[in-house]
């Protein structure tokens, strides 16, 4: 039922598939970079402007004409902390999710010219300025180099780097994707004296190999080989070092001092999972056992007389979980006080909610400074008087985000800084603080159009609106836009939240087809107050389909009882809860229970496939994009966090009975579209290949699409347009829409 009577009365156009694919209606951002406690940079018409936060006046920091003769397309820029140099990035070549190589040049802002001597080599893997001054550290060919002055020769810090084997200062595939969410494994001390770095050894890590077909003229496909530890396989090993960059010499090689992992880690496989400088000469390291329910924080001090780093056992802090794993995805980072003698950290409390705890480095126990049946999402800033954090406390809505400050001299004095600023338009905030937290930018991302504002911490006064998306607002007035419903259902006395993107002129007395948009991985959240223009907007607006998402057991930000429910049992409760959600939606009266579909990508593709293979009879059809199909095929760090090891002594049985392939027979009852990129370095094409084989083996007719040379994002312009067009046709056919 497309509600044609309503649509006829409303002459406005709908949000079409073309609108989504061509990005007709663009959300405007306001991306600033703080360069001091009162100034930020903002790019406008390719000029770099410097703004005064207090008064809002700006001046041109760098004109767009400066590099007209440069001869390269500049991908990014980075200004040295002392404002004397600008690092220009070009020849960007993507590697994995975060990693890339590029070329770099340095422009002297005083002399207004490019530095031509002692240039950084092409294909550099990572570059970073020191936190003060203008030292540079970079990684090239898996080795680390330091420049004390941009125009002087580099000092080589490491000599052991070897492609796919030894990684100095950069992460290997699994550390990049699952531990640090970054390519960089370098950490400058606050004043730039010391450079800490990790070294990863992948000598024994098995390789994933896949074909890359490249240009049509390539007669033989290239084979890509990546060290990738799958569940239960040999993992990379890690070592940690610190080098003093103030004592580098061109005569002798740099001396890196190793800090070894705690004894409780060295007894077996382990990971380095966090590095945080506490002071100029104190560093904290967090280590995690391969079985990720036990972590240790070491606090290490520099001993000037020996040049070594001492980590006292008395200062070790152990974090463990008896119900699941440590942290949301890994142990949270500590936020140290100025003297480095204490820190604040988000950990699980006794009730299983993640809150801020105050630690003194010499004491084992900590004091919780927040509490409640809600969670702290992140610590955003720490000053001598206040700690600023984002939480989902307000109105008991896990899918909301607000900025709070807590007085450090009296933990009962908590103020919500964002809750009532624009309560209708803005319920989901993130924040960017100036260097010493004197000012902050609030970024509101929904439920209304995004709004960017600037504020002073002195009195929490709003200074000005930076971007209100008013131009987009005007444009969308002429479009029949869907509305978004955020609510919850109660199952077994527990609240579970869902969202629905409802068609324009939604009428609860009518029946609508429903598409369940699923992710459902551990600590995921799909029901929130964020405004989005996406495929669901098109489906609801033009095709009158309700697009729903449900956060069941395993989802995040609502306590460990819900999140740890799927510990060691992926493919069970989170799958069952999506089916139950669809049943509940059917009972609401406005859903056509003969036209319910499900779709998901990655973990969502796995859940979609497990749901369709469950034989529930609830779903007519579904689409799985780049799905996991068997947990032994996915990487060790992610998989083992939730599943343990695939060994008979540990959890092999559940690894084997949580596969999509074992449910092949039930796919005869549904219409299935399976999609995967052939160059997916993350969820390997192997995973869909095995689903396909199992379905063929039992005689299931299904639809499939591969995307040649596409990775996990299927994000190239042509592939992106193709996949969403293809999925739209499939859904329309499934729902018998014209």
């Amino acid at each position: 039922n497309k509600g044609t009577d309503d649509a006829t009365a409303d002459s406005r156009k709908t949000y079409t598939l073309t609108d989504y694919l061509k990005n007709t209606y663009r959300l405007k951002l306001y991306s600033l970079r703080w360069i001091s406690d009162h100034e930020y940079l903002y790019k406008q018409e390719n000029n770099i402007l410097v703004f005064n936060a207090e008064y809002g006046n700006s001046s041109v920091f760098l004109e767009n004409s400066t590099f007209d003769e440069f001869g390269h397309s500049i991908n990014d820029y980075s200004i040295s902390p002392d404002g004397q140099f600008i690092l220009l990035e070009y020849n960007y070549v993507k590697q994995w999710r975060h990693s890339y190589t590029a070329s770099y040049d340095i422009y002297d802002l005083n002399k207004r010219q490019l530095i031509t001597e002692e240039r950084i080599p092409n294909n550099t893997q990572w570059v970073t300025w020191s936190p003060v001054g203008h030292k540079l550290a970079y990684v090239w060919n898996n080795d680390i180099y330091v420049k004390i002055e941009p125009n002087l020769p580099s000092y080589r810090i490491t000599w052991t780097g070897k492609e796919d084997i030894i990684y100095n200062g950069i992460t290997d595939w699994v550390y990049e994707e699952e531990v640090f969410s970054a390519y960089s494994a370098l950490w400058w001390s606050p004043n730039g004296t010391f450079l800490a770095y990790a070294q990863f050894n992948d000598t024994e890590v098995p390789l994933i190999e896949y074909s890359f077909y490249s240009d049509e003229s390539l007669q033989y496909p290239k084979t890509v080989r990546v060290p990738y530890p799958k569940a239960g396989a040999v993992n990379p090993t890690v070592k940690f070092f610190v080098v003093n960059t103030d004592s580098l010499s061109s005569v002798t090689n740099a001396t890196s001092i190793q800090i070894t992992a705690p004894a409780s880690m060295l007894i077996g496989d382990h990971y380095l999972c966090d590095v945080t400088w506490a002071t100029q000469e104190r560093i904290s390291l967090q280590w995690l056992r391969r079985i990720q329910n036990y972590s240790v924080m070491d606090i290490c001090d520099y001993d000037e007389s020996s040049g070594r780093w001492n980590c006292l056992v008395a200062r070790q802090h152990i974090e463990m979980s008896t119900t699941g794993w440590v942290g949301r995805f890994r142990p949270s980072e500590p936020h140290f006080t100025l003297d480095g003698n204490s820190f604040y950290k988000i950990i699980s409390n006794e009730e299983g909610y993640r809150h801020i705890c105050y630690f003194q480095i010499d004491k084992k126990d900590c004091t919780f400074i927040t509490k409640g049946t809600w969670e702290v999402i992140g610590i955003e800033a720490l000053t001598s008087d206040y700690l600023y954090y984002i939480s989902n406390e307000y109105k008991g809505m896990p899918g909301g985000r607000n900025l709070y400050k807590i007085q450090l001299s009296d933990y009962t004095k908590v103020t919500c800084l964002s809750c009532e600023l624009n309560p209708e338009r803005c319920q989901y905030y993130s924040v960017s603080f100036s260097k010493e937290a004197k000012y902050y930018q609030l970024r509101c991302s929904g439920p209304g159009l995004p709004l960017y504002t600037l504020h002073s911490s002195v009195n929490d006064k709003g200074l000005r609106v930076l971007e209100d998306n008013s131009a987009l607002d005007k444009m969308l007035q002429n479009v029949q836009m869907p509305s978004k419903k955020l609510d919850f259902i109660i199952l077994n006395e527990t609240k579970f939240w869902y969202q629905m993107i409802l068609p324009p002129h939604f009428d609860k007395s009518k029946k609508y087809p429903l598409l369940l948009d699923v992710y459902a991985g551990p600590c995921s959240q799909k029901a929130d107050t964020v405004f989005r223009l996406n495929w669901a907007t098109y489906l609801a607006s033009t095709e009158n389909i309700i697009v729903a998402s449900f956060d069941g057991r395993g989802s995040g930000y609502q306590g460990d009882k819900i999140m740890h429910a799927i510990n060691r049992r992926l493919g069970t409760f989170e799958v069952e809860d999506q089916i139950e959600a669809a049943r509940q939606f059917s009972k609401m009266g406005f859903v056509d229970n003969k036209r319910i579909a499900i779709w998901g990508w990655s973990y969502g593709g796995y859940v979609t496939s497990m749901v369709l293979g469950s034989g529930s009879g609830v779903f007519k059809c579904g689409i799985a994009v780049a799905p996991v199909s068997r947990w032994e095929y996915y990487d060790s760090v992610y998989t083992e966090r939730y599943m343990g090891l695939p060994t008979p002594e540990d959890n092999l049985d559940h690894y084997r009975n949580s596969t999509v392939m074992s449910r092949a027979e039930n796919f005869k009852q549904v219409e299935y579209l399976l999609i995967h990129g052939t160059a997916d370095d993350n969820v390997h094409f192997q995973q869909s290949a095995q689903i396909s084989k199992a379905l063929v083996d039992v005689g299931v007719d299904f639809q499939a699409m591969w995307y040649t040379d596409e990775d996990h994002g299927i994000a190239s312009s042509t592939a992106h347009q193709h996949i969403y067009t293809h999925m739209s046709h499939f859904i329309k056919q499934c729902f018998s829409l014209p």
Epitope: G396, E420, P447, G448, S483, F488, K495
Partner: antibody, heavy 120, light 106 residues
């Protein structure tokens, strides 16, 4: 079915206080704001304030601070509004209304209203 | 506080006639909600988030606007549409309502 049932009409003397009730049914009471709105005879609507039963937090229109006090009893899913130091100006129909979270939200369910008459 | 001014305060329309009620805000608001109230009853949600019709509201109603200027339109007036209509904002505290537009049938 989601419903808000308000208490019966009140005739009170000037200077006295009155406590109005609003009993919720058909939904999870603790999870939605209850708002109170005043409508004087032949006049428009004025928002008094809201209370969030989940944690008891409140927000008042400055105009009604000291005049209205909002409370809830979660065990009986009932919201209350106490009006103090009543004058003839307070004679009105008082509505309770639920604020729902759909996109930016709105008052989706209203009580039938309680008529308060202040007279000596 | 944000003052909402509705116009006209009172109007009458013939069946089939197009009706537009405007609501002007003293400063910019993000969304406008509209309520219908008939004598002796509580207000009913009619249009939410500027342009979305509440459940059961006939398709002849529509809402539009942004910033400080919003409107409710009836494409073809019917007898059952005779009522008082209020606009309401919650973009900043306190929540405020317009003074109401009384719509009568000719």
């Amino acid at each position: 079915e989601v419903q808000l049932q308000e208490s019966g009409a009140e005739l009170v003397k000037p200077g006295a206080s009155v406590k109005l009730s609003c009993k919720a049914s058909g939904y999870t009471f603790r999870s939605y704001d209850i708002n109170w709105v005043r409508q004087r005879p032949e006049q428009g609507l004025e928002w008094i304030g809201w209370i969030f039963p989940g944690d008891g937090s409140t927000k008042y229109n400055e105009k009604f601070k000291g005049k209205a006090t909002l409370t809830t009893d979660k065990s009986s899913s009932t919201a209350y509004m106490q009006l103090s130091r009543l004058t003839s100006e307070d004679s009105a129909v008082y509505f309770c209304a639920r604020w729902t979270v759909v996109g930016p939200g709105y008052f989706d369910v209203w009580g039938a209203g309680t008529t308060v008459t202040v007279s000596s | 506080q944000i003052v909402l001014t509705q116009s006209p305060a009172i109007m009458s329309a013939s069946p089939g006639e197009k009706v537009t009620i405007t609501c002007s805000a003293s400063s910019s608001v993000s969304y406008m909600n509209w309520f219908q109230q008939k004598p002796g009853t509580s207000p009913k949600l009619w249009i939410y988030s500027t342009s979305n019709l509440a459940s059961g509201v006939p398709a002849r109603f529509s809402g539009s606007g942004s910033g400080t200027s919003y409107s409710l339109t009836i494409s073809r007036m019917e007898a059952e549409d005779a009522a008082t209509y209020y606009c309401q904002q919650r973009s900043s505290y306190p929540n405020t309502f317009g003074g109401g537009t009384k719509l009568e049938i000719k």
